[in-house]
């Protein structure tokens, strides 16, 4: 089924994260809180009224409002999750559809330069997806993927950002670069 | 009272389609979780496919792909669209209203669906 | 899947019997048992949900025990009209699987 009402959630590679269930709130009539795993329909997580939680795993937790907390994000925890919300009737009362994507955070971006044709690079080692911006005395120059190459011309000594994001990350470097008349190394 | 009236089946050809429909009236449709459950010649009951209260669905793998389940909540009504039919699709289809953990409350009368050339 | 498996197949009872039906499910299901009374021609019918909860309407004879993977359907004084198959139905995951049935007679 194509999922057009997901809430679209990033998590962090590594990190935990929570999956909160908007506009809702605890009540007494409320009697089944179901989390599910759609790719393998599989219930990961529930609260039953005067039952123990039930978790499928120890990476779960299931708070009392509902939230769903899942435990050091593995990339197979990508993934459409499901909540459903029942009254003591059985109604659904709520439901709610989560888009969980995974990245990996990017690393400090690593700039680099030689002064011989005054050509700077700026690299990001790791990270999924990464988005990198160069600065150039605060004025932006280039957008790339992984690496920028720049050759500049306007002076020999320049302040550079780069600045490394993503979804779940942002890192940035800064490097005073200044080179000698003649463009020697 | 909670009522649910199936219609839609017959004899169809293998490798045909059909479209079963569930009317359902006594409760506020829109909310409730919803399945269809057939039961073969040899009396083996079997899920078929559930839609949730939001329009969420599971198919068993037995008939992914070539059944699809949709509700019209402002006609209160569940549709089966079956396709590609075979021979072992042969059964009696119940409309069942369920609760939070696949327990059927209410079911439907069913209707006949003979799957053969 | 998980596996339901019901047991006896058939059984066959005198009026006023207390008959035990039992229901095994291939792991642990904890008590996401659901049971049904299906008599001739006639759909399905809820009798116990969550292994022991009784169900509005169904007769106090009718009581459901156990948890994990052995779940037991007990009716209590056996009357004419209990005549016809019982099922149990495994709720804890989808697809939800059911047992064979246990047809229950009259002498």
């Known amino acids: 089924k194509e999922i057009t009402n997901a809430l679209e959630t990033w998590g962090a590679l590594g990190q935990d994260i929570n999956l909160d269930i908007p506009s809702f709130q605890m009540s007494d009539d409320i009697d089944d809180i179901k989390w599910e795993k759609t790719s393998d329909k599989k219930k990961i997580a529930q609260f039953r009224k005067e039952k123990e939680t039930f978790k499928e795993k120890d990476t779960y937790k299931l708070f009392k409002n509902g939230t769903l907390k899942i435990k050091h994000l593995k990339t197979d925890d990508q993934d459409i999750y499901k909540v459903s919300i029942y009254d003591t009737k059985g109604k659904n009362v709520l439901e709610k559809i989560f888009d969980l994507k995974i990245q990996e955070r990017v690393s400090k971006p690593k700039i680099s330069w030689t002064c011989i044709n005054t050509t700077l690079t700026c690299e990001v080692m790791n990270g999924t997806d990464p988005e990198l911006n160069l600065y150039q005395d605060g004025k932006h120059l280039k957008l790339s993927q992984r690496v920028i190459t720049h050759k500049w011309t306007t002076s020999l000594s320049a302040k550079f950002k780069c600045t490394a994001g993503n979804k779940v990350s942002k890192e940035s470097s800064v490097e005073p670069v200044s080179c000698p008349e003649k463009g020697l190394d | 009272e909670v009522q649910l009236e199936e219609s839609g089946g017959g004899l169809v050809m293998p490798g045909g389609s059909l479209k079963l429909s569930c009317a359902a009236s006594g409760f506020a449709f829109s909310s409730y979780d919803m399945s269809w459950v057939r039961q073969t010649p040899e009396k083996r009951l079997e899920w078929v496919a559930y839609i949730s209260g939001g329009g969420f669905t599971y198919y068993p793998d037995t008939v992914k792909g070539r059944f699809t389940l949709s509700r019209d909540n402002a006609k209160n009504t569940l549709y089966l669209q079956m396709s590609s039919l075979k021979s072992e699709d042969t059964a009696m289809y119940y409309c069942?209203?369920?609760?939070?953990?696949?327990?059927?409350?209410?079911w439907g009368q069913g209707t006949t669906l003979t799957v053969s050339s | 899947d998980i596996v339901m498996t019901q047991s006896p197949a058939t059984l066959s009872v005198t009026p006023g019997d207390r008959v035990f039906l039992s229901c095994r499910a291939s792991?642990?299901?904890?008590?996401?048992l659901h049971w049904y009374q299906q008599k001739s021609h006639e759909s399905p019918r809820l009798l116990i949900k969550y292994a022991s909860q009784s169900i509005s309407g169904i007769p106090s004879r009718f009581s459901g025990s156990g948890s994990g993977s052995d779940f037991t359907l007990s009716i209590n004084s056996v009357e004419p009209e209990d005549v016809g198959v019982y099922l149990c139905?495994?709720?804890?995951?989808?697809?939800?699987?059911f047992g064979g049935g246990t047809k229950l007679e009259i002498k």
């Open positions: 792991q642990s299901i904890s008590d996401f």
């Open positions: 069942a209203r369920q609760g939070a953990n696949w327990e059927l409350v209410y």
């Open positions: 139905q495994n709720g804890h995951n989808f697809p939800p699987t």
